[in-house]
């Protein structure tokens, strides 16, 4: 006996249409563009049914529901807007991804999705995770391009990018991006193991104010070629944070220096270098100083360093060193892994040049100074840990 | 014939990811149906976690949906679950399983939560 | 989410008795209702999909019947195979939900 002639579902067709079913016919529902084969909540790829010698179908007939998207991904330190509609998230709907003005910018795409047949919320590039919102890089409260030892006292948001690393000794790093610390490896080595020994804190001025943003390391991860009591080459680290931090005015990361940045970074050019480190006194500064340094040129550091008790090749290339001929102005022990920081004339952001790494035995002596890692040599290595951890 | 098989630790710490893996054996997991992640905490009865369809969507009961996370490895023809957070109330053993018109289920992985 | 509410929760019966299952669903599944039965230390078994569609290979005593809310699983001669518990699952919408499941033994 034939099946009841079978009809097809709203937005969907039916084939072979044929003037009646019978034992071991059998018919497939496909359905229009942006809908789809569903049974119940159950989606289904393709369907046929079969008339069965009792005169019945396999299967109940399915419906061509419009296809939905669902609620897009959230989007950290962003939002999401619904263009076509409040919460409509069927087939073409748009909807437009935007990040938290002044503190992060969009990575990747312009932010509009739009549901596509295939489920999928898809940028106009293809892409079907949904942007980035990265942190802006390099802004500070500063208006002048002016350290610690015969420095400044800072104010709020002018080094926000400013790590305070407790654990061991006082040591500071310089925020990348919302998760990472960077700074120099002899600061932080005797951690390189015990990561969530680590106290580090963001956001704050006064030393040791209650006011700041508690992190901690998820890792650390220390220059390969960086040998502990054996001088200061590849001094070097990044410690990866558990959380991603929230940026503010007062919590930024500072930027990697471009290609291009070593056109900033030429003698007699001025970094500003920050920390709660030693100051005239001999004391830990309460407050974040800075002071604004010169880069000396290359080879007067290096004979600076060639006469005892430094052993020669103490400077290397992978070093810039700065401070004034005349002694008075550096930074000291507690400094250690703080950025040297410089202003890129192009894109008006700060950049880190250089890490705070070593110097003489007595903090801005004159015919000395202060000798930093130079960052540009480690940009393969940064983001080479950054992209795989 | 169609199979399926789950693996992973069957002992899993307090706050930590539980993580399963299905191999599907027998069927393409792209070529059609939604598969599913069921568990059943034990003496009591059946919840659905949720699943991943032949075009890689998934769908997750709100229940969970903070916590879960269904992935795919096509090469494999493998699927698997990620659970965060987890407690002792995610005892359970957890079957993956292809619904409706084929109807497979895994022979289910006891997961015990706890320290 | 659906609530799917099946009666009774056990039930004890003989061979070759009619038994009946219900199951009612907090708001319209259409047909999209399924039955599965689980032997103790078993993997469930799917009997019925679409609420009275039989699965290849299950016995012919296993029928389902209902629409919109009220669901019915029958089996039509109660054979000792039979012990197992029995539970419901409407797949019409998220979350797929399933009865707390009917325990049913033999007299």
């Known amino acids: 006996q034939p099946c009841p002639y079978p009809m097809a579902p709203p937005n969907g067709h039916l084939s072979p249409v044929q003037a009646k079913y019978i034992l071991k016919d059998s018919f497939s529902i496909f359905c229009e563009p942006g809908y789809e084969l569903l049974q119940g909540h159950l989606p289904l790829k393709s369907f046929a049914a079969v008339c069965q010698k009792d005169g019945s179908w396999d299967q109940p007939m399915p419906s061509c529901s419009i296809v939905d998207c669902g609620p897009p991904d959230d989007l950290p330190s962003g939002r999401v807007e619904y263009i076509t509609g409040p919460e409509v998230t069927t087939y073409k709907a748009v909807i437009q991804y935007s990040c938290e003005e002044t503190f992060y910018t969009m990575k990747v795409n312009d932010g509009k999705y739009v549901c596509e047949a295939d489920g999928f919320w898809t940028s106009s590039k293809g892409e079907r995770s949904p942007p980035v919102c990265e942190p802006v890089c390099g802004l500070s409260a500063r208006t002048t391009g002016g350290r610690i030892y015969g420095g400044q006292k800072a104010k709020p948001g002018d080094f926000p990018w400013q790590v305070l690393i407790l654990g061991g000794s006082t040591a500071a790093g310089a925020l990348l991006y919302d998760n990472w610390v960077l700074t120099a490896a002899h600061a932080i080595y005797e951690q390189k193991h015990d990561a969530s020994s680590l106290d580090i804190r963001l956001g704050a001025l006064k030393r040791l104010s209650p006011h700041y943003t508690q992190a901690w390391a998820e890792a650390v991860f220390i220059h390969e070629g960086y040998t502990h009591d054996a001088g200061f080459d590849n001094d070097i680290a990044l410690i990866k944070l558990n959380n991603k931090v929230v940026i503010n005015s007062n919590i930024t990361p500072i930027c990697l220096p471009r290609k291009e940045a070593e056109s900033f970074m030429r003698t007699d050019d001025i970094g500003t270098a920050s920390g709660w480190g030693l100051t005239q006194r001999g004391l830990l500064a309460r407050n974040l100083m800075y002071v604004d340094i010169p880069i000396v040129d290359h080879q007067k550091c290096t004979a600076a360093y060639e006469k005892p008790p430094y052993s020669g090749g103490s400077v290397t290339a992978n070093m810039l060193c700065a401070g004034l001929e005349s002694g008075g102005k550096d930074s000291c022990r507690g400094d250690a892994g703080g950025a040297l920081v410089f202003l890129d004339n192009e894109t008006q952001r700060w950049f880190v040049g250089g890490i705070v790494s070593w110097g003489s035995m007595n903090c801005g002596e004159a015919g000395q100074y202060g000798v930093y890692t130079k960052v540009i040599n480690y940009i393969p290595w940064i983001k080479n840990i950054i992209s795989n951890f | 014939e169609v199979q399926l098989q789950e693996s992973g630790p069957g002992l899993v710490k307090p706050s930590q990811t539980l993580s399963l893996t299905c191999t599907v054996s027998?069927?393409?997991?792209?070529?059609?149906?939604?598969w599913n992640w069921i568990r059943q905490p034990p003496g009591k009865g059946l919840e659905w976690i949720g699943y991943i369809s032949y075009s890689g969507r998934t769908s997750y009961n709100p229940s969970l949906k903070s916590r879960v996370t269904i992935s795919r490895d096509t090469s494999k023809n493998q699927f698997s679950l990620k659970l965060s957070s987890v407690t002792a109330a995610d005892t359970a053993v957890y079957y993956c399983?292809?619904?409706?018109?084929?109807?497979?289920w895994g022979q289910g992985t006891t997961v015990t939560v706890s320290s | 989410d659906i609530q799917m509410t099946q009666s009774p929760s056990s039930l004890s019966a003989s061979v070759g008795d009619r038994v009946t299952i219900t199951c009612k669903a907090s708001?319209?599944?259409?047909?999209?209702v399924a039955w599965y039965q689980q032997k103790p230390g078993k993997v469930p078994k799917a009997l019925i999909y679409s609420a009275s569609y039989r699965y290849s290979g299950v016995p012919s005593r296993f029928s389902g019947s209902g629409s919109g809310t009220d669901f019915t699983l029958t089996i039509s001669s109660l054979q000792p195979e039979d012990v197992a518990t029995y539970y419901c699952?409407?797949?019409?919408?998220?979350?797929?939900?399933f009865g707390q499941g009917t325990k049913l033994e033999i007299k």
């Open positions: 399983a292809v619904l409706y018109a084929l109807d497979y």
């Open positions: 708001q319209n599944v259409d047909t999209n």
């Open positions: 699952q409407q797949y019409n919408s998220n979350p797929l939900t």
């Open positions: 027998g069927y393409s997991i792209t070529s059609d149906y939604a």
